[in-house]
Interface confidence: low
């Protein structure tokens, strides 16, 4: 009943708890002298299902047969309506619709650790929607039994609070769970197990790692386990990897030697335990141990390249560049690079340690045969030196690669292609493709990039340090013994029309023609490789089409003569620049009149 029901009663037959699909009879009856004042036949009894009217009747009682109630709880309320007054609540009732419990399935029991307690889980099956009681029973040797109940509507777990001990590890225990509610009961199939079947060891703890003589090849992992543990499995991986290496060990007694770790690598280690070869279950994985392996001396050799620049008749500048070793080759923190420069005939040598840079520049005489060796050093030693003879990389014209082209290849990539040199192509030992941002001043501080390509390749995709809307000077070198030939081209990964035109800074008269000088467009406004400049001119006050002269772009050129202007006519001149994507806007306008009458 849901309230005091002073004025009447609501009865439910056959029961307040019914099976889904059943019919119930609901009767609402008034107690004596609780009807409407004066006229009892004016009593109007109304039955509500929740707040929806489902039946009414004039008199002292009302009968209603209800079907099709949904799973769960439905509230019925009976009210009395008299003339000229509000409805009065008489009484109410809740009806609980559900099903009998299904047979619990997949009953399984576990004891966490040798000192833990036995707990079981099961699948309840479909929701009964009714108060259901679960009873878990465990029977063991010598007629011992334990029982535990839970009255939670969603009960699928119970802990007996008892500890099984290893005195008789082969003794059988049987567990069974029974579900009971108002509509019926059902029991699971029994689950029979031994101590070894259900004890799940605690995960190992206190994990440590030791490296004998600070060497990665002598590494031992230590841990602590519960006393009965027979098997362990270890898993470990570099911290930046998703894939685990797995090792199974028997009777490890809390230690294991690892032989395949990489130097100078942070690893994550975890261990799991089991009591028996084929019975029971593995423990959870232990907490992770993270540790860095010691350094070893570098392997591999540096990739070294160089650039020569003429200074004067007796001196040249050599700039050496090298790439960092990969992490797997460096095998530690590179502390410095050792560069040795040697004159081969005289035997003079100088050695320098470079820290914090991957380049080195020096000035040497133009005479003599020079070689360099570069190696990388960490705390354990040095890599094998990379030795190269300094030569004129572009001296051998017959070794120059032919038909070099550079085409945009997707976002921030340039595909460089070439044909082998005319000279016997089989003489080529390797190609080197070099690229750097084009700076009109030929700035030597601009970073140099390069890649090496096998002698049978005739293309290379360059993507490192390639930016959109920047022009790159690209060279392809063919190397053969102590000779080299080269070809160069300009290329960009993405281009637009330049953002501005060149700025004319001077116009001078020379023997009836004029020389126009201009400032280069700032690199960031070129928007790719410039192909041409255009010089436009027209008479100052004329509406005629301007004339134009188109000049192929050359990095160093910033002046050009024009000899088709009429004397004593004032002209307006301006310039534009073109990339493959189109023409820039005008640069500044300048006026000029031949015969020294410039404004």
């Amino acid at each position: 009943k849901i309230d005091a029901c002073k004025r009447g009663d609501v009865t439910v037959k056959p029961s307040h708890v019914i099976l889904l699909g059943s019919t119930v009879n609901i009767t609402c009856s008034l107690k004596p002298r609780q009807g409407c004042f004066h006229y009892s036949r004016r009593n109007k009894l109304i039955l509500y299902k929740f707040d929806r009217r489902i039946n009414f009747h004039h008199g002292h009682s009302l009968n209603s047969q209800v079907t099709g109630l949904p799973l769960g709880t439905t509230l019925f309320v009976c009210k009395l309506a008299c003339i000229n007054s509000d409805e009065i609540q008489i009484c109410g009732a809740e009806i609980f619709v559900g099903v009998a419990p299904e047979q619990p399935q997949n009953l399984s029991c576990i004891q966490k650790g040798e000192q833990g307690t036995v707990a079981c889980t099961w699948e309840r099956g479909r929701d009964t929607h009714l108060y259901t009681e679960y009873t878990l029973q465990l029977s063991g040797p010598k007629n011992l039994t334990w029982q535990k109940q839970c009255k939670d509507i969603y009960c699928d777990y119970l802990d007996f609070g008892i500890n099984l001990t290893p005195e008789s590890p082969e003794s059988n225990f049987t567990a069974k769970v029974t579900a009971v509610n108002s509509l019926g009961s059902s029991s699971s199939l029994p689950s029979t197990f031994t101590f070894l079947d259900i004890v799940r060891p605690l995960p190992p703890w206190d994990i440590r790692i030791k490296f004998q003589k600070a060497s990665v090849s002598r590494c031992t992992l230590y841990w602590r386990d519960e006393g009965l543990v027979l098997l362990n499995r270890l898993r470990y991986r570099p911290s930046n990897s998703r894939l685990w290496n797995m090792v199974n060990v028997t009777k490890a007694k809390g230690r294991h030697d690892l032989l395949d770790l990489k130097p100078f690598t942070e690893y994550e280690f975890q261990i799991s335990s089991k009591l028996h070869l084929y019975k029971g279950s593995w423990s959870d994985w232990s907490e992770s141990l993270r540790a860095q392996t010691p350094e070893e001396e570098p392997t591999g050799m540096l990739d070294v390249w160089y650039m020569k620049r003429h200074i004067d008749y007796s001196r040249q500048q050599i700039s050496l560049f090298w790439k960092n070793l990969s992490v797997s080759e460096a095998r530690g923190k590179i502390l410095h690079y050792q560069v040795t420069l040697q004159e081969l005939t005289g035997g003079k040598a100088m050695t320098q340690n470079i820290t914090g840079h991957t380049s080195w520049t020096t000035v040497i005489p133009r005479t003599g045969n020079w070689a360099v060796a570069v190696s990388a050093a960490n705390s354990k030693g040095s890599s094998l030196p990379t030795r190269i003879n300094i030569m004129n990389l572009c001296e051998a014209g017959l070794l120059a690669p032919r038909q070099v082209s550079a085409n945009s290849e997707g976002m921030d990539n340039i595909l460089v292609t070439w044909q082998p040199p005319r000279k016997d192509p089989s003489a080529v030992q390797e190609y080197v493709v070099e690229w750097r941002e084009l700076h009109p001043g030929g700035d030597t501080q601009v970073p140099l990039n390069w890649l090496r390509s096998r002698p049978y390749n005739v293309s290379a995709l360059i993507s490192e340090n390639i930016k959109s809307y920047i022009c790159y000077e690209i060279r392809v070198y063919a190397l053969s013994g102590d000779q080299g030939g080269c070809s160069s081209i300009l290329g960009n990964s993405k281009h637009k029309a330049p953002l501005s035109g060149p700025h004319i800074n001077a116009i001078t008269e020379e023997k009836g023609s004029i020389l126009i000088s201009w400032n280069s467009i700032p690199v960031q406004e070129q928007m790719g490789c410039l192909l041409h400049y255009r010089i436009y001119w027209k008479e100052r006050d004329s509406n005629s089409q301007p004339q134009l002269c188109e000049i192929p772009y050359r990095v160093s050129q910033n002046s050009h003569p024009i000899n088709s202007l009429q004397p004593r006519v004032t002209y307006v001149l301006w310039m534009t620049a073109l990339t493959a994507a189109g023409e820039s806007s005008h640069g500044n306008e300048r006026e000029f009149c031949l015969q020294g009458k410039a404004n």
């Epitope: 085409n407 997707g410 976002m411 959109s468 990964s493 993405k494 637009k496 994507a581 189109g582």
Partner: nanobody, 127 residues
Framework: EVQLVESGGRLVQAGDSLRLSCAAS????????VGWFRQAPGKEREFVSA???????????YYADSVKGRFSISGDYAKNTVYLQMNSLKAEDTAVYYC?????????????????WGQGTQVTVSS
């Protein structure tokens, strides 16, 4: 730079099909991407579909949500032509359809990424 010419646009009934062509001259479509855009009267230019040639193969196709499942983009490398097959046409597909090409590979739907444009071909769908 590649030059583009569209063709195939005409007046059709709602529910009909139509195939537009975009022929290129000046250079082959190697390593280009080619897109179709459309512009209805009084509206902004809108992305329709795009593909990318990798050498002589198409390695990527892409469609606007409004045409997915109805339109299909394809190409014939030997003929240096890209096609837009339009099925189940609706009145709201009425527009001038433009073909555009680019050697860059950025935001497909952005018309600023395309460096070459055709003159357009008119498609009118009457209901």
């Amino acid at each position: 730079e590649v030059q583009l010419v569209e063709s195939g646009g005409r007046l059709v009934q709602a529910g009909d099909s139509l195939r537009l062509s975009c022929a290129a001259s000046g250079r082959t479509f190697t390593n280009y991407r080619v897109g179709w855009f459309r512009q209805a009267p009084g509206k902004e230019r809108e992305f329709v579909s795009a593909l990318r040639w990798s050498s002589s193969n198409i390695d990527y196709t892409y469609y606007a949500d409004s045409v997915k499942g109805r339109f299909s983009i394809s190409g014939d490398y030997a003929k240096n032509t890209v096609y837009l097959q339009m099925n189940s046409l609706k009145a709201e597909d009425t527009a001038v359809y433009y073909c555009a090409a680019s050697t860059s590979w950025g935001v497909l739907e952005s018309d600023t990424e395309y460096t070459s444009w055709g003159q357009g071909t008119q498609v009118t769908v009457s209901s």
